[in-house]
Every structure is written in C-alpha cells, then in structure tokens.
C-alpha cells in the first residue's frame, strides 16, 4: 500500500489552531515533476457534506513530502470530508478523513467502519442533544433510511446494513429531521472487496494474518498497519510517537500523538495513534489495553507487562505476542519480512531457527502460497542457531504471495510468514530512437517504454550490421543516458536492439524489437583551392578551382560554391553536382558588389573543408545596349558591322565589345574590343570564307552594359581558310580580348 497518512489535529478549543497534515513516505512524493509523479493534494471535499462558504483554506507545503491545511475560522469549517491524494500512476491513492462537530445532535460511536464483503455493518449514532423527530440516514448525500425517534436503543440510533458489498462503501450520516446538516453524525463505511481473510481477483488468496489491528488490503494482500506498527504483518511496534510504514515519521509537539487522528489508505480508514483513544484521541489507554484506539488487549502471561504503545513486554526467557512462548520453544530468527525474486529464477531461501532441543535440518520446512511444502537441501548448524537452505523450483507469477517458514521440535513450534514478490523482467515495447548520426558513429536514446517490472538497473544495447550473421556487439549503459555507438562503418545499416535488466539474479529481460539505423557517408577530407575567377559581366562570374592529387577514388559527390555579400548579410550557394567539374559560371549576381568566395567538396550531406576565400569585386552595371546593329559581308574574310550609340548614357563610353561566334559552332565565342567609342562601324577581318557568323555587341562605361540584338551574316565564298577574325575600325587594327 502507498505510505500516505492524513493527520488531523483534534485540539478543538480553537478552530484556528486546527490543522490537517498529509505526509507521504513514498520515494519522491510531492515533488510534482514528471520524474516523480504528481504532487500531494489536500482539500476539503464538498460533494457530500456542504458547509457554508467561508474564507479559503491555506495550503502550505513543508518539504517534498508534506502538505498542511490551515485557516479554519469557525467550528463549522471543520465539519465534513477531507481528502489527501498521493502516489503516482496506478499507485495514486486517496486517504479520507471525516470530521464531526463535537456539538452535533448525534455523534458517531465510531467514525470509520471497515467490514468484509458479505458482513453486516452496524453504524451507531449516539444521542448528544435529543430531538423528538425522525432520524434520517443518508448514504453519500442521498436518502437512505428513516428511524422513529422512539427507536433509539440505549440512547443510540443503529443502522444495520446486512450483506454489504463494495458499492455500499461511502459517507453515511444520521440527522434529526429539521436539524442543520452540521448537527449530523458522519460515518465512513469501507467495504473490502473480499470476505474475511481473503484477497486478490476472485478472492482466492489468503491474507497474511495482519496483527495489532492491521487490515489486509483486498487488492494486493498487504497489511495496512495501524499508526505505530510496522512489518509485513504489523508484528513490530514503532517507538512511541512514531508512525509511517517504516516508523520514519514523528508526531509533532511535545505530547507525541495525543490529540491526533490518523487516516491511512483504505481499507484501514482512521483511528487514534497507538496508545490513545476517545473521540478526540486525548485519552490514554486503560490498563491492559494498547494500540490504535486502545482496541487491543494485552493479556500478557508469564510476568509480561502491558505497554499501551507496543503491547506485552516480556521478561527474559519468554517471547510471543502474549509472552506465551518459552525461549526453549523453537523460534524463527531474523526472517526478512519481504523478499523479491525475478520470474523463472531458482533462488535459494535461508531460514534460521533456534531452540531447545536444537532444530535440525528436517525440522525446518518452507511452505509456498499454494500449500506446497519444500524441504531444505542443506543446513548449517552453528552453536546458537540452525540455518536451513531451500532450493526453490523455477518461480512463476503465482508464487507471489505469503510464504511461511515453519520450525517444529519436541519443544513446540514457531512459524514466520514473509512476502515473496515475483517480478517480471522488463521487456522494451519499442525500438531505441536515433538522435544523431555521423559516418562512424550513431547517438541513440535507449530507454523506451517497457512491459514487466522496474526499476531498470542496466540497459544493454546490442548492434550489428544489417543482414550480418556475425556476433552482436553489446554496450552496457546507464539507464538515464544516451549512448554513442562508435567505430562503425560509414554508409552502413545497423540493426540495433535494447535489452533491459532489473535488479537481482535473472533480472535480464528479453531483447526488444530491432530498428535499422544507418551511418552517414564518410566526410570529404580534400580542401580545394581557387585557381582563378573571371568577371564575364556585371552579374556573371566564372570561377575555376583545383584539388590536391591523392591516390584512390575521390570521396565526393560535387562542389559547393559560396558567395558571401557582407554588405547585405546574404549568402549565395551554388551546387556543382559533378565531382569532376573544375569550373563554374555564376550568374544573376549583384553588380557592383564585393563578394567573398570559397569552394568546398561535399559527400552526401557532409561538407569538406572550405578553400581559402577569395575577394571579388563585380563591376557596377553598365550602359544600355547599342541600337540597330547591322552586319554586311565585304569579302570572303571580312564583315562590316554598323550600329547606333545607346540612348540615355550615364557617362562617356570607354569602349565597345563585339562578340563573334560561328553559327551552330560549339566553341567559346570571341570578344573583340573597339577602343574608339565615337565610332559607329567596324570591320571584322580574318574570317573564314562561306561561313555563317553571329554578332552582338555592348558598350562599356565603368562596367560592361547590356548586349545588343544578335545579327547573322555569311562571308563570301572561294576564300582561303583564315587564321581568325580581327577587327578594323577606320583601318586601325585591334587585338582580341578572350
């Protein structure tokens, strides 16, 4: 059961001093982060008992596992139902406290009633202030029963509930007709889901025999121990003033647990702390009584004395709940109250006993929950005890439950029950997740949802190349960390699987489903360098580069050219998709811009080192195109070009550039400068006979301008092959600019 306690301070002289505290002994309770589950909640539940609205109550968190409710201003604020919710996930548990007004017309003889399925529950409301009207009983706020005021027996109104079932659980109240609901007697009925001494689905399992008023939980068979007792069967008393499943909590204040009501998870309900009784838990137990609500009787024998907190304190030579067992009677020693094993393991369980006559191997036996008796395989005999070792057959889930070690000698017998939890090793429900990949490593998130039981102690990652029959490689990692698989092959698919383990022998679970993870290509390592670049216009740039010569195939798919315009903060990327290319024409650039240029080799998605950068200044945009370009053949090797100057010039033309290209030819065009910008005609010489040529031209001021229209003309026939075209303008020869 969840270790959750709701304490109510019942010193009711001043409601402003009243407080409710919810304490959780669960690991990480109340922290409220995802890792630890939701925080503790403590609130008044107004669904059934509605009280007049008052100022809001104050909630204070004290540390990670305690929450307190204060701010009650008048006694009516206290009346009703309060609940504390704690624990995470399937263990989320609600603890309920029902508060009655001490001045009510009717008062409950006992607030919490825990009964077994099929029992008869009897709720008893004691008359505190008589009224001569009917008494109305309600269940969870709805009408349930009417009693005539004459039906009081011994000053009490009784509600008998025969053959109760779990749905009968809830808040019951008894109220005189016309009286305020705050004058009602409020009760809490808890109906266990099973008959007495049974638990589990179908109620087939036997409860461990909870001692000292502990109540067997109908779902898990654990004893919910009264405040002040601990152990699998509540067999051990805490020191005075302590409570919690491991006696780890201490009652506040100098008077210990006096005046406090303790509410624990169902099916326990609420009671005073050990050693106290009364409606306000302020009365010490009468002699001979002990425990929560002083419900237990000591009945000590053989000179034992009754302690109201722990029961019988035995003189030396005697032991047992009533000091009824002589130390000569055999006694099981130091048996753990709870053991945990993994499914399908074959553990060894030890059971030690002492006594006179001395227990021998055959006198100690182990009984499983299904009644099977195991005999010890060996015994270690020491002067003060005999320890029997039992080899347990392969464990199955049905072995979970209460086992018993029993010792029998002619001096008597003793037995000790202990709980065995058979845990299922965890099995991943999903494949691990790939976080990042490189050519020789994969970064993997291994921890996934799993079936079976935690906690996860280790995570193993198994991996090998896809379709390989070689052995799996294994890496053991911390459950909370990501894993880097290293020294892998580039561009290779790997099958990766997770295996989870929980603590203890046989805690390794089956491997989870595989997933395919592929390493990246190898990184290109060669660094290109820029051979040169050539401005082909105000917006065009031809770039060439080289790579170092290395043996073996080139690792690369192409080149990435990057142009950085620092002024505008813009980057231009040009992809050259052939690894053999060593030149590229970059077009659509911004005239008059200063660019930083570099080139790098790429392979798959990986980039190699960038070349040292070059700085390139593109000329500003030039003048408009020359107008009305016309070509006229003069001979078998000469063609005359005529044109008109461009309009709306931004400045004086420095030269014209003529482009000459054989029509349909595959070679690069030739550029010829006309350095006399005032001219409007020029003769291109050295052409081939009977050859069709294409011409276009542009002007230059600071930068080259737009091209004119293209014109076609053929040289005349019968000439010899010329050496190449040249230009003559007014008989002046000009060189070629390629």
């Amino acid at each position: 059961a969840v270790d959750l306690t709701l304490l109510a301070n019942l010193r009711l002289t001043d409601p402003q001093r009243f407080f409710l505290t919810c304490v959780s002994g669960e690991a990480g309770a109340g922290r409220g982060s995802d890792a630890w589950g939701p925080p503790l909640l403590l609130e008044k539940d107004d669904r059934i008992v509605r009280t007049p609205p008052g100022p809001p109550l104050r909630l204070a968190r004290n540390g990670s596992h305690q929450v307190t409710l204060r701010g009650f201003s008048k006694p009516s604020d206290l009346v009703g139902v309060f609940s504390c919710v704690g624990g995470a996930g399937a263990r989320r548990t609600r603890v309920i406290y029902v508060h009655n007004s001490p001045g009510a017309h009717l008062l409950p003889d006992k607030v919490t009633h825990t009964v077994n399925k099929g029992d008869t529950a009897v709720l008893s409301a004691r008359v505190h202030k008589e009224k001569q009207t009917d008494v109305i009983w309600k269940s969870n706020g709805s009408y349930f029963y009417t009693l005539d005021w004459h039906e009081a027996q011994d000053g009490r109104f009784l509600l008998q509930l025969p053959n109760v079932q779990p749905p009968s659980s809830g808040i019951y109240s008894a109220t005189y007709l016309e009286a305020s609901p705050l004058g009602s007697a409020f009760f809490r009925l808890i109906v266990r889901g099973c008959g007495a001494g049974r638990w589990g689905p179908g109620c087939t399992k036997e409860c461990p025999g909870c001692l000292h008023g502990g109540v067997c939980h109908d779902h898990d068979g654990e004893c919910v121990c009264p405040p002040g007792f601990t152990g699998t069967r509540c067999e051990q008393a805490c020191r005075e003033g302590r409570f919690g499943q491991s006696c780890q909590e201490q009652c506040p204040g100098i008077s210990g647990c006096r005046g406090l009501t303790f509410c624990l998870p169902d099916p326990y309900g609420c009671s005073c702390g050990s050693g106290w009784r009364g409606s306000q838990c302020q009365e010490a137990c009468a002699p001979g009584h002990f425990g929560a609500d002083c419900r237990l009787q000591c009945q000590c024998q053989n000179g034992g004395t009754c302690d109201r907190f722990s029961g019988c304190v035995c003189p030396s030579g005697w032991h047992g709940v009533h000091c009824e067992k002589s130390d000569r009677i055999p006694q099981i020693l130091n048996m753990a109250s709870e053991l945990e094993f993994n499914l399908e393991t074959m553990p060894r369980i030890n059971c030690a006993a002492a006594g006179n006559p001395f227990p021998v191997r055959g006198s100690i036996e182990l009984r499983k929950p299904d009644g099977t008796v195991l005999l010890s395989t060996k015994a270690i005999v020491e002067p003060e005890k005999t320890t029997a070792e039992f080899e347990v057959p392969r464990l199955v889930l049905a072995d979970s439950g209460f086992w018993e070690c029993r010792v029998s000698t002619s001096g008597g017998q003793d037995s000790r029950r202990f709980k065995v939890n058979v845990k299922v090793p965890p099995v991943p429900l999903a494949a691990p997740r790939l976080l990042t990949k490189q050519s020789r490593q994969l970064v993997v998130s291994p921890l996934v949802s799993f079936s079976g039981d935690g906690p996860i102690s280790t995570v193993r990652l198994h991996y090998r190349p896809q379709d390989s029959t070689m052995d799996w490689s294994t890496i053991v990692v911390d459950p909370s960390e990501n894993v880097t698989l290293m020294n892998l092959r580039p561009k290779t698919g790997y099958s990766v699987r997770v295996q989870l383990s929980r603590p203890g022998e046989g805690g390794e679970g089956a491997w989870g489903p595989p997933t395919l993870m592929t390493t990246d290509c190898p990184e290109p390592l060669l660094q290109p360098w820029l051979e040169g670049w050539h401005v082909e216009g105000t917006d065009r740039l031809r770039v060439s580069w080289s790579l170092p010569l290395v043996p073996g195939p080139l690792v690369g798919d192409g080149f990435l050219l990057r142009l950085w315009d620092g002024t505008r903060g813009q980057e231009r990327r040009e992809n050259v998709s052939s690894p053999q290319a060593r030149t590229a024409l970059l077009t659509g650039l911004t005239p008059g811009t200063h660019y930083q240029l570099d080139v790098q080799l790429y392979h798959c998605t990986l980039l190699g080192p960038a070349s040292p950068p070059a700085h390139v200044l593109l000329p500003p945009s030039g003048p408009p195109a020359p107008r009305h370009l016309h070509a006229q053949a003069l001979s078998d090797s000469e063609i005359q070009l005529t044109w008109k100057h461009p309009e709306a010039l931004p400045g004086p033309i420095s030269k014209y550039v003529v482009e000459v290209q054989v029509a349909g030819g595959a070679g690069d065009p030739l550029w010829i400068d006309v350095d006399r910008p005032e001219e409007t005609s020029t003769i291109i010489r050295g052409l081939n006979a009977s050859t069709r040529y294409l011409f276009r031209m542009r002007a230059s001021i600071q930068g080259l301008g737009d091209w004119s229209n293209t014109v076609e003309e053929s040289t005349l026939g019968n000439g010899l092959q010329a050496e190449g075209p040249v230009q003559e303008s007014r008989a002046a020869e000009e060189g070629l600019d390629q």
């Epitope: 001569q132 009207t133 009917d134 109305i136 009408y143 349930f144 029963y145 009417t146 009693l147 005539d148 005021w149 004459h150 039906e151 007709l177 016309e178």
Partner: antibody, heavy 117, light 110 residues
Framework: EVQLLESGGGLVQPGGSLRLSCAAS????????MGWVRQAPGKGLEWVSS????????YYADSVKGRFTISRDNSKNTLYLQMNSLRAEDTAMYYC??????????WGQGTLVTVSS | QSALTQPASVSGSPGQSITISCTGT?????????VSWYQQHPGKAPQLMIY???KRPSGLSNRFSGSKSDNTASLTISGLQAEDEADYYC??????????FGGGTKLTVL
C-alpha cells in the same frame, strides 16, 4: 419513477372490514417510512397512520386508533391498512404515501372506501 | 389533533403574488420547522410543493416559497399562472410521530 398503486377499496356496511393494499415500485421500499392519508368527499386531507421501514413503530390518528392497523411486507414491496369496525365517517378516498422528508412526498392516485348501509 | 387553520379561499390575477397562511399551535407549527405544503387539482392526488418549512423538491418552480413565524406558516406563490388554480393544504409534524393537515385553501386565478 416512484409509483404507488392503491387497491382494496369499495362499498362496505357500517361495522364491516376492508383491507387496503398499496403496491410500491421505483424505489427501495424497505428503506422508507410509509403512511395512509384520507380525504372525505369535498373535504380536506386527514392523516390516518404511519409505519417505519422495519415495520417497527406504527402511529395512528385518534379517530382510527384501535380500529385500523397499518402493516407492511418489505419482501413484496406492499403496504397494508386493515380497517375494522368501519363507520360512515370513514367514507373517503384513501391515499398511500411515501415519506422521505418527514412528510408525504409521493402519493398514489387513491382508492375510494364507501361505508354505507 | 385539531386541524391547522387556513383561509377557505384566496384569489389573484395572473402575474400577481398571493400568500396562503396556515395557523397552528405551539405544539405543532410553533414547535417544529416541519411544515409541508401540497397542491391538489380536482380529481388528482396531492403533490408536495414545500417541505421543512421552506425547502423545495428538486424540479419545482421557484415561484413557490415557504416561511414560518411563530405558530403561523405561509406559502407564497409569485407570478401567478392559470395552472396554479387548485386546492392547497398545509401539513405539520405534531409530535409523537403524528401529522396534522390544514383544512385547505381554494386558489382562484382571476
């Protein structure tokens, strides 16, 4: 839906007897206080008798005390009124009523009892 | 067990408010806050309108309200409607687990 169906009324001579029944449905009969209320023709309502859920305490109006007996059978969800030594002034519509709030909250449609020679 | 005293008749126009009184003694109305009111249309069974002096059964119109002062209880109907025309009876707990009814009031909606 709560339903109460009275039966057993009719014409009876003075000094005679009648047994009225009330069949209940739509609620847990065994938990409720039940009663009979009558209404003489053209007159007001008059409480006759009440019985508590367990069949325990029973109460009667002075006008019927010693002559009428109220009873119930929780296993049959039925309320009864045994009327003996009937008088002309007992002529009325007899209503069966359920009480949840200290007074009748649901009523049947009634059964007419006529005492006449 | 004397009957509680109610006016034989009251009347009002649609939309108006009317009040019906019910006078008892210190042994019944005066001692307990357990007055209930019933509406009865001709030929029909009575229907509970108010209980414990001023509480309304769920689903009943809030035009009906009840109150008590000393030995007199009152039923007020606001926003009178034609379907409110009926006989109205008060009833009080009278101690010793007995009940006493009023003589009834005929409400006429003009």
């Amino acid at each position: 839906e709560v339903q109460l169906l009275e039966s057993g009324g009719g014409l009876v001579q003075p000094g005679g007897s009648l047994r009225l029944s009330c069949a209940a449905s739509g609620f847990t009969f065994s938990r409720y206080k039940m009663g009979w209320v009558r209404q003489a023709p053209g007159k007001g309502l008059e409480w006759v008798s009440s019985i508590y859920p367990s069949g325990g305490p029973t109460y009667y109006a002075d006008s019927v005390k010693g002559r009428f007996t109220i009873s119930r059978d929780n296993s049959k969800n039925t309320l009864y009124l045994q009327m003996n030594s009937l008088r002309a002034e007992d002529t009325a519509m007899y209503y069966c009523a359920r009480s949840e709030v200290g007074a009748p909250d649901y009523w049947g449609q009634g059964t007419l009892v006529t005492v006449s020679s | 067990q004397s009957a509680l005293t109610q006016p034989a008749s009251v009347s009002g126009s649609p939309g108006q408010s009317i009040t019906i009184s019910c006078t008892g003694t210190s042994s019944d109305v005066g001692s307990y806050n357990l007055v209930s009111w019933y509406q009865q249309h001709p030929g029909k069974a009575p229907q509970l309108m108010i209980y414990e002096g001023s509480k309304r059964p769920s689903g009943l119109s809030n035009r009906f309200s009840g109150s008590k002062s000393d030995n007199t209880a009152s039923l007020t109907i606001s926003g009178l409607q034609a379907e409110d025309e009926a006989d109205y009876y008060c009833c009080s707990y009278a101690g010793s687990s007995t009940l006493v009814f009023g003589g009834g009031t005929k409400l006429t909606v003009l």
